[in-house]
Amino acid sequence: MDNQGVIYSDLNLPPNPKRKQQKPKGNTSSILVTEQEITYVELNLQKTSQDFQGNYKTNHCKDLPSVPEKLIAGILGIICLILMASVVTIVVIPSTLTQKHNNSSLNTRTQKACHCGHCPEEWITYSNSCYYIGKEKRTWAESLLACTLKNSSLLSIDNEEEMKFLTAISPSTWTGVFRDSSQHPWVTINGLTFKHEIKDSDNAEHNCAMLHARGLKSDRCGSSKIYHCKHKL
Amino acid sequence: MAVFKTTLWRLISGTLGIICLSLMATLGILLKNSFTKLSVEPAYTPGPNIELQKDSDCCSCHEKWVGYRCNCYFISSEEKTWNESRHFCASQKSSLLQLQNRDELDFMSSSQHFYWIGLSYSEEHTAWLWENGSALSQYLFPSFETFKPKNCIAYNSKGNALDESCETKNRYICKQQLI
């Protein structure tokens, strides 16, 4: 992106009165600005070459050395090289543009040859969702926060199939279901009332729900358990 | 002579100018494509890129299969004999699990179950071979010398293996490599 800046200074082009300084909008601003810069360089190149031609016409009779032609050729040569480099860069490394975009994720990833980018590395995919399978134990609140920081949410289970799959791979993990007290209903982290059966619900100290081998059961929110995060596509 | 030189430089300039314009147009198109690609994608989330999923089969696993690292796994919840498991995997254009290393299944390390894997004893080679004919690496199962040749091998994700009668019904894992 800086290459265009070099073109500017080499050409000493006057500022474009029509071009406003744009505030970057999200992740695409650099590209927008670059397009404007390219157009601007193009227009001003034409103007510059016209000026050179004008000078040449007036000076031609005096048989002065053809400095403007050489200068124009030199400048065009440099521009050609720079543009060629830009084209090659964009064609050869298509990921360079998306790199900044992807780096904003907390899960910075080193791309493997086979890694297709469906999910961050070390996450698993299953039926249109990505799962982070945690190894470390956390309290329910810590697990909720850890998943939020991973741009995902604490495990939610949408159907019987997913329930079977999750109990097969990890039968003891926090889920995104809790209640304020035993007098309150079980709710999901989205605030919806949770209707599925949770065992041991009559224990007043058990206000967070976990997945276990035979379904869901309540437990103390302060106890440490493995946590999984989920991100739906 | 000066006129010829001037004409030559003009010719060079003109050619370079045309090259510049075509390169600029190319760059513009490339940038525009990159820009639209970015504006279509949401801010990065850990979720798979659905565009990718549609475009390239090499990158996505079938429904109810687990994608991890560069492989797809079918983790059964029903039990079959070793042969039934092998046939099921074959019918899914995959094979019973061939382990590359001991931590391959670390995403399911808290699972309690044992699963049939694609390891069987070859009388011909007097060795334990994977379905593709490659030999079992010694460090995978240090206890493999105690395995009975007539048995089949069940594995759990904690890294333990045991030999059982091939007619025993166990869960099983099929594996498909993405690349």
């Epitope: 289970i157 035993s182 009332t193 209707k195 599925h196 | -």
Partner: antibody
């Protein structure tokens, strides 16, 4: 421990109404669906309907539409069945039940002991 | 409404016997069936849900099977406490409907 407590019996006049209660303990009724079932010796078991205590949504068997009204009081963790315009046909034992609802599998795991309603002049 | 036809209405059996009670639905119900037990003068107790799954605390001598429209409850090696009334209930669609019941008596 999950329990559903119902009053033992109600004696009512024909044409009157009766409101039966079912008080739950060991769980919060907002987290399940509460059902009502009618039992008569010759007719067997008939499902009346169910209510979602979290939002008051109800489903009824067509036969009981207009006859039965289902409500809940979440503060007392109680479900109610009101029967109107009573006739001798409404003489029966009425049971409340907690729906077992879990990812594709449902059913009745817990039941109240039933309230005998006798409609008699 | 889905009609649930339960058979037999009653049966006399001895302790230690194995018995099967069947329920036929007027249309396929995809395992959306439960089995209930009612002891004389008592309330109901859930035994089986979703066709084959045992409710918590139910002895393993009870088992459920079936698919489509036909389902059965099997009690192996009957014990004295198993003599009661048994009902099937479908919850594939509203209104939920019950079988007519089977009375299990000691021979």
């Amino acid at each position: 421990e999950v329990q559903l407590q119902q009053s033992v019996a109600e004696l009512v006049r024909p044409g009157a109404s009766v409101k039966l209660s079912c008080t739950a303990s060991g769980f919060n009724i907002q987290n399940t669906y509460m059902h009502w079932v009618k039992e008569r010796p010759e007719q067997g078991l008939e499902w009346i309907g169910r209510i979602d205590p979290a939002n008051g949504d109800t489903e009824f068997a067509p036969k009981f539409q207009g006859k039965a009204t289902l409500t809940t009081d979440t503060s007392s963790n109680t479900a109610y069945l009101q029967l109107s315009s009573l006739t001798s046909e409404d003489t029966a034992i009425y049971y409340c039940g907690r729906e077992r609802y879990f990812y594709g599998s449902r059913g009745f795991a817990y039941w109240g002991q039933g309230t005998l309603v006798t409609v008699s002049a | 409404d889905i009609l649930m036809t339960q058979s037999p209405p009653s049966m006399s059996v001895s302790l230690g016997d194995t018995v099967s009670i069947t329920c036929h639905a007027s249309q396929g119900i995809s395992s959306n069936i439960g089995w209930l037990q009612q002891k004389p003068g008592k309330s109901f107790k859930g035994l089986i849900y979703h066709g084959t799954n045992l409710e918590d605390g139910v002895p393993s001598r009870f088992s459920g099977s079936g698919s489509g429209a036909d389902y059965s409850l099997t009690i192996s090696s009957l014990e004295s406490e198993d003599f009661a009334d048994y009902y099937c209930v479908q919850y594939a669609q509203f209104p939920w409907t019950f079988g007519g019941g089977t009375k299990l008596e000691i021979k």
